[in-house]
């Protein structure tokens, strides 16, 4: 049995098919999920759809053997098997391992630590999303690309704000969160606040009280 891997985003419509031609004049074609749970069977020129969680959202194309599934969900994660009974009476099978992933949510950036160290500003940020297995990448004025959920950096004294973007991604989607930092390091003169992504057109920022006031008056 040949095994093909497919990763798709939840809610999408999926086509399960094989990359080769079906055996000529086959007698029967059946799609299963797991070993022996039937979804649909084509026999004697007719398609029979079985009572299963897929009923009403699958369609078989007997010509190509393709199985169309609408609105896949994470619960549809499975190995799908297409078995064909050939005209010589022998069975042939193909397997597709389907992984359905939810789109990643927008990340939340948390300030873990912020302190003065020898006139420089030590900053530790974490990029948080709820219970997901994802990849992280930080972008900004950094010495090297950082590929984990925590960013640690030391900033030399500066007058302008610095922004750091955390990108979270899985194989079907990616989302960004941006943190903008305005001096001073320890907010003695002005308290810095976090503004939601919605407020800032999809970006998440930490800005000064002054900026906040200005932002809300626009």
């Amino acid at each position: 049995g040949r095994l093909v891997h497919m990763t798709v985003v939840s809610g999408s419509n999926v086509t399960l098919n094989i990359s080769e031609s079906l055996p000529e004049n086959y007698k029967q074609l059946t799609w299963f999920y797991t070993f022996d749970q039937k979804i649909v069977e084509w026999d004697s020129g007719k398609s029979k759809y079985f009572e299963s969680k897929f009923k009403g959202r699958v369609r078989l194309d007997p010509q190509s053997g393709a199985l169309y599934i609408s609105k896949v969900q994470k619960e549809d994660n499975s190995t799908y098997v297409m078995r064909v009974l050939k005209k010589d009476g022998y069975e042939q099978e193909w397997k597709i391992k389907l992984q359905v992933l939810d789109p990643v949510p927008k990340p939340v950036i948390k300030i873990e630590k912020r302190e003065d160290v020898d006139d420089n500003c030590y900053l530790k940020l974490s990029c948080v999303i709820p219970g997901e297995s994802v990849n992280y990448t930080w972008y900004g004025e950094l010495p090297k690309e950082i590929q984990n959920s925590v960013l640690e950096t030391t900033l030399k004294p500066h007058k302008h704000s610095r922004c750091y973007t955390c990108q979270v991604s899985n194989s079907v989607s990616s989302k960004n969160g941006t943190f903008c930092f305005s001096p001073p390091c320890t907010a003695a003169r002005s308290e810095q606040k976090l503004i939601s992504e919605e407020d800032l057109g999809g970006e998440q920022k930490l800005i000064s009280e002054e900026d906040l006031h200005h932002h809300h008056h626009h």
Partner: antibody, heavy 118, light 108 residues
């Protein structure tokens, strides 16, 4: 007429191994999934393992997973069950059965007795 | 997994009597994917009924099956001497396939 004939059973010590065979005739063997079902003395039927017609997919009961291996040789019309790390609770008559259209078991062989005892 | 419970465990009857065997599933068996088997002492099981109510090839019409969802019945309209045996139900609506524990029909 479809016929299934099991062999290979016998007495084995706990931790030992056995290989059961099932010779099939009277149908296109490679077109059908096959199964092993067992029955402990005086007890009910317990499905053990399944294999697709092509041999490309296998499936096991939790009680035997990692210890039993089902395989087939379609050129010899023969089904096998390799059993290792045998336990007393594996003692049973082992039947091979044609897994009719991936639904029910029909027909069955006459069975072969496996006894695991020290 | 679906658990099948058969009742009664044993039935003591005489030839000519009508028999009703019950098989109850722990959850609904989709599309009545239920089979019945007969097993005589020292023999392999034999398929009697599939799809809850369809008789297998060569099975006499005194055997009939009915039911859906969680409750299924095997009826033998008139017991013949060769019908004394153990009867098992099996569901094939979900994986793994499971069997009931059996009902023994013995001579009174």
């Amino acid at each position: 007429e479809v016929q299934l004939l099991e062999s290979g059973g016998g007495l084995v010590h706990p931790g030992g191994s056995l290989r059961l065979s099932c010779a099939a005739s009277g149908f296109t063997f490679g077109g059908y999934a096959m199964s092993w079902v067992r029955q402990a003395p005086g007890k009910g039927l317990e499905w053990v393992s399944l294999i697709s017609g092509s041999g490309g997919s296998t499936y096991y009961a939790d009680s035997v997973k990692g210890r039993f291996t089902i395989f087939r040789d379609n050129s010899k019309n023969t089904l096998y069950l390799q059993m290792i790390s045998l336990r007393a609770e594996d003692s049973a008559v082992y039947y091979c059965a044609k897994y009719s259209n991936y639904d029910y078991f029909d027909p069955w062989g006459q069975g072969t007795l496996v006894t695991v005892s020290s | 997994e679906i658990v099948l419970t058969q009742s009664p465990g044993t039935l003591s009857l005489s030839p000519g009597e009508r028999v009703t065997l019950s098989c109850r599933a722990s959850q609904s068996v989709s599309s009545s994917y239920l089979a019945w088997y007969q097993q005589k002492p020292g023999q392999a099981p034999r398929l009697l009924i599939y799809g809850a109510s369809s008789r297998a090839t060569g099975i006499p019409d005194r055997f009939s099956g009915s039911g859906s969802g969680t409750d299924f019945t095997l009826t033998i309209s008139r017991l013949e001497p060769e019908d004394f045996a153990v009867y098992y139900c099996q569901q094939y609506g979900s994986s793994p396939r499971t069997f009931g524990q059996g009902t023994k029909v013995e001579i009174k």
